[in-house]
């Protein structure tokens, strides 16, 4: 039951994360740059990994897509491409993490690959948070070291002037969302993980000789107690003690990876 | 690199009218600002309007009702009707644009080179 529970609410909280990520990528509100007031009215600039915005305080909201792949700073290629490679891998991990749940059975699906997928999506989940983290603190560095805003200069352009003018860029929203997301996915998949080692079969069975007592037909198994995890039910846990003896191929056994021989 | 192409200025009568355009052209993002300064002989650049593309203007004092400012958003143009104009307003006037670069490059103000304006009694 915890396991499951555990499970469950790794993937709900992953799912929340991931959704969270889209949201960041998709918002225009990774930097901002404060009202500033001029004679004509109030203007508020806002910039997303995708397009510029600019709104007035009349309402009037205007934006424009960045005009090439090519002219864009690397940091920002870097964090576009972080925050995709973190969609990416958590969508596929929320895929994989569907068919892992304990609660939904499909076909014959054994514990084992149960476990196992629940640790992919898991890892999966963890290093999409971490993307998110990381494209968003790659960013949030940028805005602070301010690189393109050191000095107001002006000089002479295409025929005309150019001056820049001095200004600050802050955080916005979406920074923030992308680092609440970031850390929602990256716990979501740390519970997976979790989940992962009470979903894991860690029986230990004892292949054993039969032995054969003079005057009755019993097999004593030594071992026929199973060890368990201590996870979910076991309902194999009995006392194997059979009415005749028999060969160790007869008796039908679930060998795992951590039998001792 | 952003180009402010100026065209419509000339010699005219006083009482006369003209109509400047300014047409920006480039790798343009947010534009917060278009308008016009200009500059008499002998004196300091001043503002003759501006307006938002949301078509909030602003006017030097008395030019308000004289001149008209508006733009097309479509293009990226700016244009300033001058109407009744008088030998003061002779000057070199340059059309203006502040941009938005944001994280690409921060706030800018381009000016263009100017187109001269002579009105003769």
């Known amino acids: 039951m915890a396991v499951t529970a555990c499970q469950g609410l790794g993937f709900v909280v992953s799912l929340i994360g991931i959704a969270g990520i889209i949201a960041a990528t998709c918002m225009d509100q990774w930097s901002t740059q404060d009202l500033y007031n001029n004679p004509v009215t109030a203007v508020f600039n806002y910039q997303g990994l995708w397009r510029s915005c600019v709104r007035e305080s009349s309402g009037f909201t205007e934006c424009r897509g960045y005009f090439t792949l090519l002219g864009l700073p690397a940091m920002l290629q870097a964090v576009r491409a972080l925050m995709i490679v973190g969609i990416v891998l958590g969508a596929i991990g929320l895929l994989v993490s569907i068919f892992a749940l304990k609660c939904i059975r499909i076909g014959s699906m054994e514990d084992s690959a149960k476990a196992n997928m629940t640790l992919t999506s898991g890892i999966m989940f963890i290093v999409s948070g971490l993307c998110a983290i990381a494209g968003v603190s790659v960013f949030a560095n940028m805005l602070v070291t301010n690189f393109w805003m050191s000095t107001a200069n002006m000089y002479t352009g295409m025929g005309g002037m150019v001056q820049t003018v001095q200004t600050r860029y802050t955080f916005g929203a979406a920074l923030f969302v992308g680092w609440v997301a970031g850390g929602l996915t990256l716990i979501g998949g740390v519970m997976m993980c979790i989940a992962c080692r009470g979903l894991a079969p860690e029986e230990t069975n004892y292949k054993a000789v039969s032995y054969h007592a003079s005057g009755h037909s019993v097999a004593y198994k030594p071992g026929g107690f199973k060890a368990s995890t201590g996870f979910g039910s076991n309902t194999k846990n009995k006392k194997i003690y059979d009415g005749g003896a028999r060969t160790e191929d007869e008796v039908q056994s679930y060998p795992s990876k951590h039998d001792y021989v | 690199e952003v180009q402010l192409v100026e065209s419509g200025g000339g010699l005219v009568q006083a009482g006369g009218s003209l109509r400047l355009s300014c047409a920006a052209s480039?790798?343009?993002?947010?534009?917060?600002?278009m308008g016009w300064y200009r500059q008499a002989p002998g004196k300091e650049r001043e503002l003759v309007a501006t307006?938002?593309?949301?078509?909030?203007?602003n006017y030097q004092g008395n030019l308000k009702g004289r001149f008209i400012i508006s733009g097309d958003n479509t293009k990226d143009t700016v244009y300033l009707q001058m109407n009744n104009l008088q030998p003061e307003d002779t000057a070199v006037y340059y059309c203006?644009?502040?941009?938005?670069?944001?994280?690409?490059?921060?706030?800018?103000?381009?000016w263009g080179p100017g187109t001269q304006v002579t009105v003769s009694s």
């Open positions: 203006y644009f502040r941009i938005n670069f944001g994280i690409l490059g921060g706030l800018r103000d381009y």
């Open positions: 480039g790798n343009i993002l947010s534009i917060n600002y």
């Open positions: 307006i938002t593309r949301g078509g909030s203007t």
